[in-house]
């Protein structure tokens, strides 16, 4: 399977909610003995191999945000955690998955990983992460709205197998 | 090796427009915001504005009608400029790099060029 | 803005003895649990240099000597034992909400 971003680009004002989004593409094992572990973070846009860094969204970790389950099941985070610092993620019966970010600053301007992992039980893991830009405008040059960039082809199904 | 230099007249005349640029290596010009910091002489730091990474520029209310900040990537260049010149602009104009991908803060800053306004 | 004070604004030091700054902030530098407070150290004809960034981190090649603490409004950097090489003007300065702003700056001289 691959993970594709939709949006490369997300570009958004101050005080506005917005949802990155990445895809799961591809043959899924619904096997019983297969669950996916997604999660969302924060990494360095100087990175030679991107999102190799996994740094905090809003002080929560990986672990803080995932969601573990099997299939394309529906899951979300319902902690309180990730609601205190304005955070939800999420993933749909399609093979959508996705973090929504509440009430946007300067601050949350950054890359954004999403990263899935096979687990086969006894087996191997099979690992997969997209990246997309946020950036938070402030000022007369932000716009009212968040306006996103699609991804190229090319970028949209970017896989970085491990 | 990450660098950033300043460049410009030392001497601008009142009401004129001061215009500086700094020339940056090292780095990806879509990775970092580049702000400009001046020194007034005898004087603490005092930041003017920033353009980030995608190209949107923030400013100090006390400068905004009269700065404009931008970029030329094909040149590795952030430009200055202020407008309307007073003998109080005459400072040690700066350029700094900030690390923004998590931890906001200046990490790498140019030499500085002083610039005195002056008839 | 966000106006930041600190105090002493200069002060005279033994080497080998400890010093330490303090900066207040007019309202909090926290964002979801990190501090956007920084320390930079301007030495004479130089510009400044990071020492500190999110309130405790000591940046790389920094000497251990040097440490950051607090959180909120009230912050802290300390010289567990000052040398002559820490003669300079030190400065703090918020990254919490634009414009970011500088303490006014504190003289560290030797005795």
């Known amino acids: 399977f691959k993970v594709a971003t939709p949006y490369s680009l997300y570009v958004c004002p101050e005080g506005q909610n917005v949802t990155l989004t990445c895809r799961l593409l591809g043959p899924v094992d619904k096997g019983h003995d297969v669950t996916f572990y997604k999660t969302w973070y924060r990494s360095s846009r100087g990175e030679v191999q991107t999102c190799s860094e996994r740094r905090p969204i809003r002080n929560l970790t990986f672990q803080d945000l995932h969601l573990h389950h099997g299939g394309h099941q529906a899951a979300n985070t319902s902690h309180d955690l990730a609601q205190r610092h304005g955070l939800e993620s999420a993933s749909d019966h399609h093979g959508n998955f996705s973090i929504t970010m509440r009430n946007l600053t300067l601050l949350d301007s950054g890359l954004y990983c999403c990263l899935v992992v096979e687990i086969r039980h006894h087996h191997s893991e099979h690992r997969v992460h997209g990246a997309m830009e946020l950036q938070v405008q402030t000022g007369k040059d932000a716009p009212s709205n968040c306006v996103v960039y699609p991804s190229s082809s090319q970028d949209s199904e970017n896989i970085t197998a491990a | 090796q990450v660098q950033l230099q300043e460049s410009g007249p030392g001497l601008v005349k009142p009401s004129e427009t001061l215009s500086l640029t700094c020339t940056v290596s090292?780095?990806?010009?879509?990775?970092?915001?580049v702000h400009w910091i001046r020194q007034p002489p005898g004087k603490g730091l005092e930041w003017i504005g920033v353009i980030w990474s995608g190209g949107n520029t923030d400013y100090n209310a006390a400068f905004i009608s009269r700065v404009t900040i931008s970029v030329d990537t094909s040149k590795n260049q952030f430009s200055l400029k202020l407008s309307s010149v007073t003998a109080a602009d005459t400072a040690v104009y700066y350029c700094?790099?900030?690390?923004?991908?998590?931890?906001?803060?200046?990490?790498?800053w140019g030499q500085g060029t002083t610039v005195t306004v002056s008839s | 803005d966000i106006v930041m004070t600190q105090t002493p604004l200069s002060l005279s030091v033994t080497p080998g003895q400890p010093a330490s700054i303090s900066c207040r902030a007019s309202e909090s530098v926290e964002y979801y649990g990190t501090s956007l407070m920084q320390w930079y150290l301007q030495k004479p004809g130089q510009p400044p240099q990071l020492l500190i960034y999110a309130a405790s981190n000591v940046k790389s090649g920094v000497p251990d000597r040097f440490s950051g603490s607090g959180s909120g409004t009230d912050f802290t950097l300390k010289i567990s034992r000052v040398e002559a090489e820490d003669v300079g003007v030190y400065y703090c300065?918020?990254?919490?909400?634009?414009?970011?702003?500088f303490g006014q700056g504190t003289k560290l001289e030797i005795k």
């Open positions: 700094a790099r900030e690390d923004y991908d998590y931890d906001w803060y200046f990490d790498v």
């Open positions: 300065q918020q990254s919490r909400k634009v414009p970011w702003t």
């Open positions: 090292g780095f990806s010009l879509t990775s970092s915001g």
